[in-house]
Interface confidence: medium
């Protein structure tokens, strides 16, 4: 099966790398614009220069192209806790990230939210916090893990999963008391 090519891909494949086919004259291959620039006018003829213009402030192109407009710079999403790691330039989009001691949680391929790394209070760090993953905690005896925080077994309700973790603790205490009375 031949993979389906879009019109632009079909047109580009006719020309050598770094060139694209003139939209009005398919016998002409024009040189693509460098990153940081966009296509203002197609080349008038073979061997003639493509008219490329530099992207304006607030826009960019990150690779060679024949785009009629530069792409708008991304804005870091403050409401998701994101901070700017590096500003947008004409040839590179804004880079957003998280603060120190935070990790990225991806809600979708392009959307991440910054969350504080768990400190594992009342537990120990099993795996350190990573760029895209929270700390993995192991809780001390008498505590159970709920949403990656160690919570006292006194907060364990019968209906919750924690009964499996906390019940042996309660039984052991009772067992010790019983053995002490016999």
């Amino acid at each position: 099966l031949v993979p389906h090519l879009g019109d632009r891909e079909k047109r580009d494949s006719v020309c050598p790398q770094g060139k694209y086919i003139h939209p009005q004259n398919n016998s002409i291959c024009c040189t693509k614009c460098h990153k940081g620039t966009y296509l203002y006018n197609d080349c008038p003829g073979p061997g003639q220069d493509t008219d490329c213009r530099e992207c304006e402030s607030g826009s960019f192109t990150a690779s060679e192209n024949h785009l009629r407009h530069c792409l708008s710079c991304s804005k870091c999403r403050k409401e998701m806790g994101q901070v700017e790691i590096s500003s947008c330039t004409v040839d590179r989009d804004t880079v957003c990230g998280c603060r120190k001691n935070q990790y990225r949680h991806y809600w979708s391929e392009n959307l991440f939210q910054c969350f504080n790394c768990s400190l594992c209070l009342n537990g120990t760090v099993h795996l350190s916090c990573q760029e895209k993953q929270n700390t993995v905690c192991t809780c001390h005896a008498g505590f159970f893990l709920r949403e990656n925080e160690c919570v006292s077994c006194s907060n364990c309700k019968k209906s919750l999963e924690c009964t499996k973790l906390c019940l042996p603790q309660i039984e052991n205490v009772k067992g010790t008391e019983d053995s002490g009375t016999t």
Partner: nanobody
Framework: EVQLLESGGGLVQPGGSLRLSCAAS????????MGWVRQAPGKGLEWVSQ????????YYTHSVKGRFTISRDNSKNTLYLQMNSLRAEDTAVYYC????????????WGQGTLVTVSS
Amino acid sequence: EVQLLESGGGLVQPGGSLRLSCAASGFTFLKYSMGWVRQAPGKGLEWVSQISDTADRTYYTHSVKGRFTISRDNSKNTLYLQMNSLRAEDTAVYYCAIYTGRWVPFEYWGQGTLVTVSS
């Protein structure tokens, strides 16, 4: 003291609608992103939707996109979730939460409001 009081849940038939409200107090409501998180019976917490402090950006988990609408009224310190075309899998306790680098107050949420979708 931070208080979040959710209301508006109930029993509804599949395809029906509900509007949840969350009355917030004890903090400067208009400074924070707010969200809705739900917990289905026997399951973990699931992020549902979020709205920025100025309400100019909203986010939804894939399964509710196009059906749920989050909104807020900063003058009333109230967060809303309009739920349309409800499905059985939307059955859960819904909690409203503040985002401050984590979902606060986390294990100290209020009672939430139970939404049951059943015929």
